[in-house]
């Protein structure tokens, strides 16, 4: 018999759903490690990034309904007392407890499909999620730390003689920030009570026959790339060109 | 060592019924679903239905509701099936099998019962 | 109710060759990240025996030379090397509410 192991190759399934809402399922990897078990079965859990604003879907392990006594999704979020849905299939019935957040449900009627959804992903529904099915000769588990990601707004400008200005605003978690070709750079972040952080290099460079510097931007969500033409003029305020 | 063994084999005239049994060991037998599947000679396994006995659930092929009953015997960790109304059709390998919760995935067989119906 | 068609339904083979068994579901057995499709190996007056569940998982104690693949209606058994002991017929199943086995393919000696 096999008891799902950890697997680090996340499969990430992205569609288009209603409202132009992004849709991403992470379930379990059809090639994962198995192993033998006995009563304890083993606490399956994937860390799963995903991009604020997007619509998904949470899965239980592969266990027919016929098999089960009860299914439960524990919901922890930060600063939050936990949350627990619970569906007992002898009375069919479903039971909350402190679950406030109407955008996580049950994506149908338990008996029909445990996966659980979260609709329009922010940045509060960061935190731990598990699926816990019962059975008669003991328990399985399928847990996911969420985290959310959130692009940040990527601007370059010159504000100095040969100085250039990037910034990555209130991204999660925070971006990294490179230039070609390199400079002399310094690199500060700031933190916000919302868990962003933005980025803020700036390089200066001393060599004249550097005309034209690129800032890369590379973050979970996706990288960026912006340029900009050093003005030789002090003073003078160059916006950036994306490609 | 998980075990499952069924009785032996038997020999029907048309119209009777027969009772095939499957003795489950080295498990808890409550804990598992037991499904049951036929194969006739030379033909693909046919799924006749399984039981519950944790609840006493049992669902049935639409192709055997009416003829055959699945009942288990708790106390004595043994899951039945009946087959009434027998024709020759029925003339198969019968098997029990128990249906593991990971994938819903059958490691354990019993053995097989040839049931002939002759008339 | 899911049909299993497998093809094809019967192969001529020598030990060492690689074998592939196809089996196509009439609708999606793929629901929730998993496929539930699973391959047996029966032997004349034996009960089957499972080699793969989960359409890629390979059950304990099976040879590694048994891989299966595939996703919503279109699943592969692959043997790469084939052995004397593997002469047999596999099957394919479906078993998510209701069960369903292929035809079967018989592997048998060239």
């Known amino acids: 018999e096999g008891a799902a192991q950890p697997n680090n190759s996340l499969m990430l399934q992205t569609s288009k759903e209603n409202h132009a809402l992004a849709s991403s399922s992470l379930c379990m990897d059809e090639k994962q490690i198995t192993q033998n078990y006995s009563k304890v079965l083993a606490e399956v859990n994937t860390s799963w990034p995903v991009k604020m604003a997007t619509n998904a879907v949470l899965c239980c392990p592969p266990i027919a309904l016929r098999n089960l006594i009860i299914i439960t999704w524990e919901i922890i979020l930060r600063g939050q007392p936990s949350c627990t849905k619970a569906y007992k299939k002898e009375t069919n019935e479903t039971k909350e407890t402190n679950c406030t957040d109407e955008r996580i449900t049950w994506v149908s009627r338990p008996d029909q499909n445990s996966d659980l959804q979260i609709r329009t992903v922010a940045i509060t529904h960061d935190g731990y999620y598990r699926c816990i099915m019962v059975t008669p000769d003991g328990n399985f588990h399928r847990g996911y730390h969420l985290q959310v990601l959130v692009t940040p707004e990527v601007t370059l400008f010159q504000n100095r003689n040969r100085t250039a200005v990037c910034k990555a605003v209130a991204g999660k978690p925070a971006a990294h920030i490179s230039w070609i070709p390199e400079g002399d750079c310094a690199t500060k972040q700031e933190y916000w009570s919302n868990g962003t952080v933005t980025v803020k290099s700036t390089c200066h460079w001393e060599v004249h026959n550097v005309s034209t510097v690129t800032c890369h931007v590379s973050h979970l969500t996706g990288n960026k790339s912006l340029y900009i033409e050093l003005l030789p003029v002090p003073g003078a305020k160059k916006s950036a060109k994306l490609y | 060592e998980v075990q499952l063994v069924q009785s032996g084999a038997e020999v029907k005239k048309p119209g009777a019924s027969v009772k095939v049994s499957c003795k489950a060991s080295?498990?808890?037998?409550?804990?598992?679903?037991m499904f049951w599947v036929r194969q006739a000679p030379g033909q693909r396994l046919e799924w006749i239905g399984y039981i519950n006995p944790y609840n006493d659930d049992t669902k049935y092929n639409e192709k055997f509701k009416g003829r055959a009953t699945l009942t288990s015997d708790k106390s004595a960790s043994t899951a039945y099936m009946e087959l009434s109304s027998l024709r020759s059709e029925d003339t198969a390998v019968y098997y029990c099998?128990?249906?593991?919760?990971?994938?819903?995935?059958?490691?354990?067989w019993g053995q097989g019962t040839l049931v002939t119906v002759s008339s | 109710d899911i049909q299993l068609t497998q093809s094809p339904s019967s192969l001529s083979a020598s030990v060492g060759d690689r074998v592939t068994i196809t089996c196509r579901a009439s609708?999606?057995?793929?629901?929730?990240?998993?496929?539930?499709m699973h391959w047996y190996q029966q032997k004349p007056g034996k009960p089957p025996k499972l080699l793969i569940y989960?359409?890629?998982n390979l059950e304990s104690g099976v040879p590694s030379r048994f891989s299966g693949s595939g996703s919503g209606t279109d699943f592969t058994l692959t043997i790469s090397s084939l052995q004397p002991e593997d002469f047999a017929t596999y099957y394919c199943q479906h078993n998510r509410e209701l069960l369903t086995f292929g035809g079967g393919t018989k592997v048998e000696i060239k």
């Open positions: 989960l359409a890629s």
């Open positions: 099998a128990r249906e593991d919760y990971y994938g819903s995935r059958f490691v354990y």
């Open positions: 609708k999606s057995v793929s629901t929730s990240g998993y496929s539930y």
């Open positions: 080295g498990y808890t037998f409550t804990s598992y679903v």
